[in-house]
């Protein structure tokens, strides 16, 4: 099954949400509307 990383730090395994503690992908705009980095 595909493995996805989710907003506040989730991975989806077999459609189950499993939280992991380190804000995975938080530098990629995981939080809706939060400015990330500079203008690129």
């Amino acid at each position: 099954d595909a493995e996805f990383r989710h907003d506040s730090g989730y991975e989806v395994h077999h459609q189950k949400l499993v939280f992991f503690a380190e804000d995975v992908g938080s530098n990629k705009g995981a939080i809706i509307g939060l400015m990330v980095g500079g203008v690129v």
Epitope: S8, A21, D23, G29, A30, I31, I32, M35, V40
Partner: antibody, heavy 112, light 111 residues
Framework: QVQLVQSGAEVKEPGASVKVSCTGS????????VHWLRQLPEKGLEWIGR????????IYTPKFQDKATLTVDTSTDTAYMELSSLRSEDTAVYYC?????WGQGTLVTVSS | DIVMTQSPLSNPVTPGEPASISCRSS???????????LYWYLQKPGQSPQLLIY???HLASGVPDRFSSSGSGTDFTLKISRVEAEDVGVYYC????????FGQGTKVEIK
């Protein structure tokens, strides 16, 4: 001016599909997640899902899993959300969001 | 789904006076990593929403410091120390402990 520009309002018949676009202006949309939300008339916000433009990976709210399809064309810095099997309950303003930038919203009206 | 419930649904305010909005989640948003996955958004009339507060008590860039947020795992409060005319609109709380869900909104208007 840095902004996200969405396509214009759409009127569709029940059962049809619609594809809403979201283009970065002065902003590389392919760098950050693109979120899509909707706002029903006089109602609150619902998160539809998000796409990682780097690899196309998506996450959807379960109720939109079979309704919405999120894609990105990195060559044109444009994100798309396609809604299928439209019903009157899908009448809403749809927003894209990337980093701190919000699109202006696209009104989709479903009516026979 | 985690359900977010806001009160009041309408909040007439007086410019210069403080105001507060409450939000309750059906499940604790405090994770064992110490972060609380609670957010506040404001949608001004005729505009797209904007982020005010992230992870319960962090002010988003450009948001005036008259806004503050506090709470426990399930009960949260957004406070405006001195309301200004530009603060009118609909305020939403949201969570992303499990995907994203939003409260029904609180309309803040000038008395």
């Amino acid at each position: 001016q840095v902004q996200l520009v969405q396509s214009g309002a759409e009127v569709k018949e029940p059962g049809a599909s619609v594809k809403v676009s979201c283009t970065g202006s002065g902003f590389n949309i392919h760098v950050y997640y693109v979120h899509w939300l909707r706002q029903l008339p006089e109602k609150g916000l619902e998160w539809i899902g998000r796409i990682d433009p780097e690899n196309g990976e998506t996450i959807y709210t379960p109720k939109f899993q079979d309704k919405a399809t999120l894609t990105v064309d990195t060559s044109t810095d444009t994100a798309y959300m396609e809604l299928s099997s439209l019903r009157s309950e899908d009448t809403a303003v749809y927003y894209c969001v990337s980093s701190g930038y919000w699109g202006q919203g696209t009104l989709v009206t479903v009516s026979s | 789904d985690i359900v977010m419930t806001q009160s009041p649904l309408s909040n007439p305010v007086t410019p210069g006076e403080p105001a507060s909005i409450s939000c309750r989640s059906s499940k604790s948003l405090l994770h064992r990593n110490g972060k609380t996955y609670l957010y506040w958004y404001l949608q001004k009339p005729g505009q797209s929403p904007q982020l005010l507060i992230y992870q319960m008590d962090h002010l988003a860039s450009g948001v005036p410091d008259r806004f503050s947020s506090s709470g426990s795992g399930t009960d949260f409060t957004l406070k405006i120390s001195r309301v200004e005319a530009e603060d009118v609109g609909v305020y939403y709380c949201a969570q992303n402990l499990e995907l994203w869900t939003f409260g029904q909104g609180t309309k803040v208007e000038i008395k």
